[in-house]
């Protein structure tokens, strides 16, 4: 039970306190007790629960006709059963006595009264009304966890407006009052009583620019919403009439956890007795409800396709024509930015990363918009994010980037188990140098920090600078899988592509050529390739840096080898020593639930089928998925990207609750 | 044959700052690997920075990092040299260069290294 | 100091031949075959005339040519003009955080 106020009763004059319903009163008896008195009795009103503890020895007994010895190990506590109907209506009437005195007495009028602040603190999506109790006061995880949640209200449910609906001080309807959290102050007292009380909505400052607090007028349009807390206000006289009353209030969140922000917003309600004009209010009662504001949650491969983003432009026809059957495959939605629209740039993946925020009652997608800010720096903000669809950035808006802060270098794991560890939606993986140098490049330190502070997909960092470009898609992706732990992880392997060569070339296909049926490009024969011993060192120095994220991915994610498939791949180092793709990378491919869209490779024709393409199948195809191979050659593999670069997914939120896990 | 023309110099106070742009025709500038060199008066050439600019990866001289930022704008066929927190030593004709980024190539080629195609330079002086 | 040495001159009659040399070290000349060189008339831009040691680019006269031993490269030009009067410059791919450098130049006189 929640800490009420201590009372102190005197003798001379009776004493007059207000008691909230749910909270436990001290009661102080001893400091204004006559002089020649060593012991109490109390008599109370039927509303009213006395209970008296002395110590030593911890014996407790309700009150009766019994004496108490008058000393300081006696507490003295008191509950109310009932809100009073009018002012002072319950009693408690302290004797004082002594040996040689007829007993004195204390009076004490008490007015029982219902406040208090409810929000779903249970997250079942319903405003369950709560009395003050101590837990609504701290925020837990897990299961049995409690505490209300807040969703950032970063979606812009009016298509006339250019910005996020938590940038204005208006409900827009009803619409934009669901990506709020309802929040609830329920009072019940006699009709006087807020003649001589206040109550006072408040949040601390250092929390008040990331909430916003709007009160609704009962029965009356959405419209009627106003604003009572926010940025620019931290705390709100409330007019509140007396008897049982109800007031709603619509939250939402301005801001993500980020570094200096852990995600923790309290608001509270204090009541404040202003009976005495010429004294300073003073507080009589608070009660608070902690609310956590929704993490940004990414979804992997494994989760089900919802929609595929892909641009349109010069002479990708046949690209978008695979990429529209694969989407009509997955039965997916798609969407199409226009030339005009993209300014040339491409790469759908590095623009965006789409994600999601729940709360118990809604959930919303939402675009993460990364800050290379390119051709397709307006795509997020102007077509993506709109009505039910949220939007987020970070970073540096104007310079300041390198190349791996675009998101073909962040990904997300399944949901994995690393020793005691759950990790139930999964791992951020994220590509860094090995090492700061000089020219080292690095994701933002913005980014990191926010991914790092959603704390529900603990970010694990790899090491991609070896790539030219520099993301982690050139070397990596996640397929489902019927067994085992749902998915698989595909690497990029020279080793597993030199293997499959050297193979081909014993059974007397030597002479079969690479990059057949692609104008303009030296054709290169099996053994060629083999021989080039150039080559090879550079895919030895390439394979060294796989291997290197291959046994950091198995350690961060609790994988085992089964867990992982060789995906044949050779790569070369050009300017500066950097990685890029020899033949179309395979392993950046669109995964839209069993049908993946695979860069084709070009690869040696032996028997009629491209060595290459027969072996990924071979590899995937008993997983139960489908493998297309898409010619991505001109238009994005010597552009140095392939599928998944010039892709993008919306994805199906996690049925996992991320409130339910333990981070 | 791609063409490159430099613009942008001029008299900037130490401390100040400058962009250079070297505007590409008769070429796409995504094709090419583009690089700044610079010559102090009198001197010999002094190799400054370079993007990759169908990747933006870029590369720095010590004597520039992080002061100088380069960076392209391949709608424009347009790649820029900003220039902060000049220097007097900063002084100099800045060139810019390319060379084509051949992606035929079974290993690398080394085109990054040099520059087969030339702007005709675009003079920097810094000076109080 | 440039980071590559060359001799500040050299000079040939016309008809002669003459070698320019650009030492390095075992973490450029020596290491990779990334070495150019570039030909500069004053107030000229500088012109490509050798790159990866030995190559020309088309429309260079075939009386420039380049070689490499060890951390010295060399650039000879045989057959001199009068035109082939100009500075030189020898460059190279380094495993320096800088990674290309110039030699100093070479002013070349043809008598």
């Known amino acids: 039970m929640a800490q009420g106020t201590l009372i102190r009763v005197t003798p001379e004059q009776p004493t007059h306190a207000v008691c909230v319903l749910g909270t436990l009163t001290q009661l102080d008896v001893c400091s204004s007790a006559p002089e020649d008195c060593t012991s109490f009795s109390v008599n109370t009103s039927p509303g009213v629960v006395v209970d008296i503890a002395h110590s030593p020895p911890a014996k407790k007994k309700s009150t009766g006709s019994s004496t108490w010895p008058l000393d300081p190990g006696v507490e003295v506590t008191l509950t109310m059963k009932a809100a009073s109907g009018s002012t002072g209506d319950q009693k408690v009437q302290i004797s004082y006595h002594g040996p040689k005195t007829p007993p004195v007495k204390a009076l004490l009028y008490l007015t029982g009264v219902e406040i208090s602040l409810s929000a779903d603190i249970t997250r079942t999506g319903k405003v369950k009304p709560t009395r003050a109790v101590e837990d609504k006061r701290t925020w837990t995880w897990g299961p049995c966890g409690q505490g209300a949640i807040l969703l950032v209200n970063c979606d812009r449910d009016n298509p006339e407006s250019s910005a996020m609906d938590c940038e204005d001080d208006e409900v827009l309807d009803s619409k934009d009052l669901k990506d709020m959290s309802l929040m609830t102050l329920s009072t019940k007292t006699p009709q006087d009583f807020f003649t001589r009380h206040t109550l006072v909505l408040h949040v601390a400052r250092s929390e008040m620019d990331k909430v916003r607090v709007f009160q609704a007028t009962r029965g009356r349009l959405s419209s009627r919403c106003r604003v009572v807390l926010g940025p620019k206000q931290p705390s709100h006289y409330l007019m509140v009439p007396g008897g049982k009353h109800n007031m709603d209030f619509y939250v939402e969140a301005l801001a993500f956890p980020d570094t200096n922000f852990p995600g923790l917003i309290t608001l509270t309600v204090s009541m404040l007795d202003t009976s005495k004009l010429e004294l300073p209010e003073a507080v009589v009662f608070q009660d608070s409800v902690v609310f956590r504001v929704a993490p940004w949650i990414m979804t992997p491969n494994t989760q089900p396709p919802q929609e595929v983003y892909v641009c349109s432009i010069f002479e990708n026809e046949d690209f978008l024509k695979s990429v529209t059957a694969l989407a009509m495959q997955a039965r997916c939605k798609l969407t199409i930015c226009p030339e005009e629209e993209n300014m040339d740039d491409q790469w759908m993946q590095d623009e965006m990363e789409i994600g999601y925020i729940q709360a118990p009652h809604k959930t919303l997608p939402v675009v993460f918009d990364s800050p290379r800010n390119r051709g397709l720096k307006e795509f997020p903000i102007k077509r993506v994010m709109g009505p039910d669809f949220g939007y987020v950035t970070r970073g540096p808006q104007t310079g300041g980037v390198s190349g791996l802060d675009s998101f073909g270098n962040l990904e997300v794991s399944p949901p994995v188990t690393v020793g005691d560890k759950e990790y139930p939606l999964g791992r951020i993986l994220f590509g860094d140098s090995c090492y700061p140098s000089s020219d080292s490049r690095e994701m933002h330190q913005a980014l990191q920090d926010f991914l790092s502070a959603q704390q529900v997909q603990a970010p694990v960092k790899l090491y991609s600078d070896w790539l030219t470009v520099g993301h982690v898609d050139e070397f990596l992706s996640f397929v489902p899988a019927p067994d085992r732990k749902g998915f698989r992880l595909l690497l990029a392997s020279p080793r597993s592509c030199y293997k499959l060569f050297q193979e081909q070339q014993n059974e007397g296909h030597g002479d079969a050529l690479l990059f057949q049926g692609i104008k303009k490009k030296n054709q290169q024969k099996i053994k060629n390739i083999l021989s080039n011993t150039t080559l090879r060192e550079h895919n030895s120095f390439v394979e060294r840096c796989i291997d290197w994220n291959r046994e950091l991915l198995k350690r961060e994610l609790g994988l085992a080898e089964s867990d992982i498939i060789d995906i044949p791949q050779l790569f070369k180092l050009k300017e500066f020593s950097k990685a890029e793709a020899f033949f179309p990378n395979m392993v950046n491919m669109l995964v839209l639930g069993k049908h993946l869209g695979i860069p084709k490779p070009f690869g040696p024709i032996i028997n009629g089928r491209c060595c290459l393409e027969e072996k990924v199948c071979s590899l995937l195809e008993p997983l139960g998925l489908h493998c297309t191979f898409i010619n991505d050659f001109y238009t994005y593999h010597i552009r140095h990207g392939e599928v998944h670069c010039g892709t993008n997914v919306r994805r199906k939120p996690f049925s996992f609750k991320w409130w339910n896990m333990v981070p | 044959q791609v063409q490159l023309v430099e613009s942008g110099g001029g008299l900037v106070k130490p401390g100040g700052s400058l962009r250079l742009s070297c505007a590409a025709s008769g070429s796409t500038l995504s094709d090419y690997f583009v690089s700044w060199i610079r010559q102090a008066p009198g001197k010999g050439l002094e190799w400054v920075s370079f993007i990759n600019t169908a990747n933006t990866f870029t590369y720095y001289a010590d004597s520039v990092r992080g002061r100088f930022t380069i960076s392209r704008d391949n709608a424009k066929n347009t790649v820029y040299l900003q220039m902060n927190s000049l220097r007097a030593e900063d002084t100099a004709v800045y060139y810019c260069s390319s060379a084509n980024d051949d992606v035929d190539d079974i290993v690398a080629p080394g085109r990054g290294y040099y520059m087969d195609v030339w702007g005709r330079g675009t003079l920097v002086t810094v000076s109080s | 100091q440039s980071a590559l040495t060359q001799p500040r001159s050299v000079s040939g009659s016309p008809g002669q031949s003459v070698t320019i040399s650009c030492t390095g070290t075992r973490g450029d000349v020596g290491r990779y075959n990334h070495v150019s060189w570039y030909q500069q008339h004053p107030g000229k831009a500088p012109k490509l005339i050798i790159y990866?040691?030995?190559e020309r680019p088309s429309g260079v006269p075939d009386r420039f040519s380049g070689s490499k031993s060890g951390n010295t490269a060399s650039l000879t030009i045989s057959g001199l003009q009068a035109e082939d009067e100009a500075d030189y410059y020898c460059s190279s791919h380094s495993r320096s955080s800088t990674p290309v450098l110039f030699g100093g130049g070479t002013k070349l006189t043809v008598l």
């Open positions: 990866n040691v030995y």
